[in-house]
């Protein structure tokens, strides 16, 4: 195989378009990301260039290994689209577009509890709301560190609600909720709310 490729050979599949990818597609503002531009042809010395729209961001030479471009996504317009150009001598091919999804992280949610007390049961309604963060937000409710609800998806800035009925317990119960959106590995928790045991008239959240 020729080390130097002429443009005639570009008409064949000897020099296909490069591939542009990133391990993270969903990012938050201020996040550092790495973009990888690679080519199937491992024997050629290739010059890789990265573009966001028509703005040239950088150039690297490589042979057999992907070119790595490190960026910081600080503004909405930096979400893309990005393209990578692979060039050998005067011949070039561009990758498909790659765009990031910029997501604002969720802030710590607030858990509110409302209880209706009967002689035998407590009817508990849990409300959880994160006032900031890109929608949709998935909320999960916990009792004593164990999930007691499925993930509840909210596409509006309204609290997630979960109802449960419990026999009047003899022990304290601790509740909290988790808020999570599309940002990977990024979840926040409410402050725990402790529900006291039923000894005496101690039900601060109860509707009398």
């Amino acid at each position: 195989r020729k080390a130097v490729l002429d443009c005639e050979a570009m008409k064949t599949n000897e020099f296909p378009s490069p591939c542009l990818d990133s391990k993270t597609k969903v990012v938050m503002k201020g996040q550092n990301v790495s973009m990888f531009c690679s080519h199937k042809n491992k024997s050629l010395q290739i010059t890789y260039s990265l573009f966001r729209r028509k703005t040239h961001l950088g150039t690297q030479d490589g042979k057999g290994e992907p070119a790595i471009f490190n960026l910081s996504i600080t503004e909405a317009h930096e979400s893309g689209p990005y393209k990578c150009k692979a060039q050998v001598t005067s011949c070039s091919k561009y990758s498909r577009d790659f765009s990031f999804t910029i997501v604002d992280p969720v802030t710590s949610p607030v858990l509110n509890i409302m209880v209706i007390q009967t002689e035998t049961d407590r009817h508990i309604t849990l409300h959880c709301l994160s006032v900031n963060g890109s929608l949709p937000i998935n909320y999960t409710f916990f009792e004593n560190h164990v999930a007691i609800s499925p993930a509840i998806s909210k596409y509006d800035r309204e609290p997630a609600e979960f109802n449960l009925t419990k026999k009047n317990p003899g022990e304290e119960e601790e509740y909290r909720c988790e808020a999570k959106n599309r940002l990977p590995n990024y979840a926040t928790y409410s402050h725990p709310v402790t529900m006291p045991s039923t000894g005496g008239d101690s039900c601060p959240f109860c509707l009398k």
Epitope: C7, F51, R53, K54, H56, A76, K85, C91, Y94
Partner: antibody
Framework: EVQLVESGGGLVQPGGSLRLSCAAS?????????MCWVRQAPGKCLEWIGC?????????YYASWAKGRFTISRDNSKNTVYLQMNSLRAEDTAVYYC??????????????WGQGTLVTVSS | DIQMTQSPSSLSASVGDRVTITCQSS????????LAWYQQKPGKAPKLLIY???TLASGVPSRFSGSGSGTDFTLTISSLQPEDFATYYC????????????FGCGTKVTVL
């Protein structure tokens, strides 16, 4: 109807300045395009001058020969782009076209053109 | 600079004729196919006919076709119609340290 309308052309003396306007109707600049200027001297080739991106940052792209004397700007609230031309010479005499293209790196072709405005540089 | 050379600079033909115009760039255009063709009638703005060397722009009749890659490109009108008498331009694009959008100087198609 989607259209581009250029204005501001006319007779100017060598060394003088002129600002051309391109008003876009039926186009929402917030949809993000490159708004460009291309000129055509009488009986000569078309010649690309430069472009401005209508998105928030407004990246500019110029032909290397145009840098310095020619400045492109925009007013998104008026859906208008401008071409400021300084230190004009006789060879700048041409019909100046406003043209639109997509904002992606592969949107290099001009898919909408205005009717052009004539600039004559002469003493 | 990238130079786009069109040939012929003018040609005369009759309605129904097959017309071929060539465009040669001084170096390979970007992506091997970033070349567009435009039609311009006197006193009018250019109109996009073909982009990516061979893709027909919206609303362009199928008698127009484009081919080529790298440095050599062709515009073909399979059966010339009265409304096709005009000047045709090619435009090639590539990036070095700046963007280049270079036009050929045109091929004028007139009635024989």
């Amino acid at each position: 109807e989607v259209q581009l309308v250029e204005s501001g052309g006319g007779l100017v003396q060598p060394g003088g300045s002129l600002r051309l306007s391109c008003a876009a109707s039926g186009i929402d600049f917030s949809s993000y395009y490159d708004m460009c200027w291309v000129r055509q001297a009488p009986g000569k080739c078309l010649e690309w001058i430069g472009c401005i991106y209508t998105g928030s940052v407004g990246e500019l792209y110029y032909a290397s020969w145009a840098k310095g004397r020619f400045t492109i700007s925009r007013d998104n609230s008026k859906n208008t782009v401008y071409l400021q031309m300084n230190s004009l010479r006789a060879e700048d005499t041409a019909v100046y076209y406003c043209a639109r293209r997509g904002s992606g790196v592969d949107d290099y072709y001009f898919n909408l053109w205005g009717q052009g405005t004539l600039v004559t540089v002469s003493s | 600079d990238i130079q786009m050379t069109q040939s012929p600079s003018s040609l005369s033909a009759s309605v129904g004729d097959r017309v071929t115009i060539t465009c040669q760039s001084s170096q390979s255009v970007d992506n091997n196919n970033w070349l567009a063709w435009y039609q311009q009638k006197p006193g009018k703005a250019p109109k996009l006919l073909i982009y990516d060397a061979s893709t027909l722009a919206s609303g362009v009749p199928s008698r127009f076709s484009g081919s080529g890659s790298g440095t050599d490109f062709t515009l073909t009108i399979s059966s010339l119609q009265p409304e096709d008498f005009a000047t045709y331009y090619c435009q090639g694009t590539y990036y070095t340290t700046d963007w280049w959008n270079s036009f050929g100087c045109g091929t004028k198609v007139t009635v024989l």
